[in-house]
């Protein structure tokens, strides 16, 4: 990996678990400049592998609301608008980091957690397995 | 929102910016149980809107490595294996949270940051706009 010199202005850490426990500023900086969310907002409907979005809420997690994609069909939509079962709609999944309140119900203490979320769906050729 | 009673065993926060600055345990808890990553790992190749994955590395960010999807074609792959330009491959984007070292190069001080990543691609019917 890349070694970076430590900034002398860094806060001290007296925590015995350092570097496992760190200070995090929750004042979110949004780097998503020049993006037009409207453009991708309707892909879930226009896709050949359309999906529905389900709200997953957990007050012990930050962010507390996460949207999960569920593919509408097993097959994909063909040119005639019908479901074609020769192809399959599959979820595209991504591992994301969230903050979990630990101990529970604490406003200022968290633990990093890795969760798998389905972001949308794509249309794939199924792999054929010959079974006995 | 849901109000949760505060746990009396919570750590104290003497930070003047509380609750903006919190303690986070970086010992990641992985909730991805019963998932088979092999199943979705080759969707990028089998999709009708295939994509390539590009490594984005930033030592000032946690996680330092993020994989970005770039659609291979403007069109989608048809049943004959050719690119069909009546349809479009588009990236499915998701906003994710990362930790940014702040001040820079500090090992134990971070700020939450929201970034937009492309997770994969899906095949959509293009919207036709009639312009003058």
């Amino acid at each position: 990996g890349i070694t970076i010199p430590r900034n002398p202005g860094c806060p001290n850490s007296e925590d015995k678990n350092f570097p496992r426990t760190v200070m995090v500023n929750l004042n979110i900086h949004n780097r998503n400049t020049n993006t037009n969310p409207k453009r991708s907002s309707d892909y879930y409907n226009r896709s050949t592998s359309p999906w529905n979005l389900h709200r997953n809420e957990d007050p012990e997690r930050y962010p507390s609301v996460i949207w999960e994609a569920k593919c509408r069909h097993l097959g994909c939509i063909n040119a005639d608008g019908n479901v074609d079962y020769h192809m399959n709609s599959v979820p595209i999944q991504q591992e994301i980091l969230v903050l979990r309140r630990e101990p529970p119900h604490c406003p200022n203490s968290f633990r990093l957690e890795k969760i798998l979320v389905s972001v949308g769906c794509t249309c794939v050729t199924p792999i054929v397995h010959h079974v006995a | 929102g849901i109000t949760i009673p505060r746990n009396p065993g919570c750590p104290n926060s003497e930070d003047k910016n509380f609750p903006r600055t919190v303690m986070v345990n970086l010992n990641i808890h992985n909730r991805n149980t019963n998932t088979n990553p092999k199943r979705s790992s080759d969707y990028y190749n089998r999709s009708t809107s295939p994509w390539n994955l590009h490594r984005n590395e930033d030592p000032e960010r946690y996680p330092s490595v993020i994989w970005e999807a770039k659609c291979r074609h403007l069109g989608c792959i048809n049943a004959d294996g050719n690119v069909d330009y009546h349809m479009n491959s588009v990236p499915i984007q998701q906003e994710i949270l990362v930790l940014r070292r702040e001040p820079p190069h500090c090992p134990n001080s971070f700020r939450l940051e929201k970034i937009l990543v492309s997770v994969g691609c899906t095949c959509v019917t293009p919207i036709v706009h009639h312009v003058a």
């Epitope: 097993l74 079962y85 979820p91 199924p126 397995h129 079974v131 | -």
Partner: nanobody, 116 residues
């Protein structure tokens, strides 16, 4: 591991009927389907009929609509394909399939021969 056990193929005269059955065991998700493909040697495999595991939605190839009926007994994950008014062009090896999103499991096949 998915396992498929097929039965019910055979020789039948034009206009006759046959019933195929197939039982599936193993990991079955809520977003899966069971069905039948058929193949004539040297030709492309054709999806004949399919039934969704939980929704019960059915799909039929145009060539068999009105003649073939797919049904399912949920309790033991068994599907049936009732084939009526059979034609010589229905002659093929019929494969029971279990389709999980992205993966298609196919049985060993059962031969259906329709003689004129």
């Amino acid at each position: 591991q998915v396992q498929l056990v097929e039965s019910g193929g055979g020789l039948v005269r034009t206009g006759g009927s046959l019933r195929l059955s197939c039982s599936v065991s193993g990991d079955i998700s809520s977003q899966s389907a069971m069905g039948w493909y058929r193949q004539v040697p040297g030709r492309q495999r054709e999806l004949v009929a399919m039934i969704h595991t939980t929704k019960g939605d059915t799909y039929y190839a145009d060539s068999v609509k009105g003649r073939f009926t797919i049904s399912r007994i949920n309790a033991n994950n068994t599907i049936y394909l009732q084939m009526n008014n059979l034609k010589p062009e229905d002659t093929a090896i019929y494969y029971c399939t279990h389709n999980e999103p992205g993966d298609l499991y196919m049985g060993q096949g059962t031969l259906v021969t329709v003689s004129s």
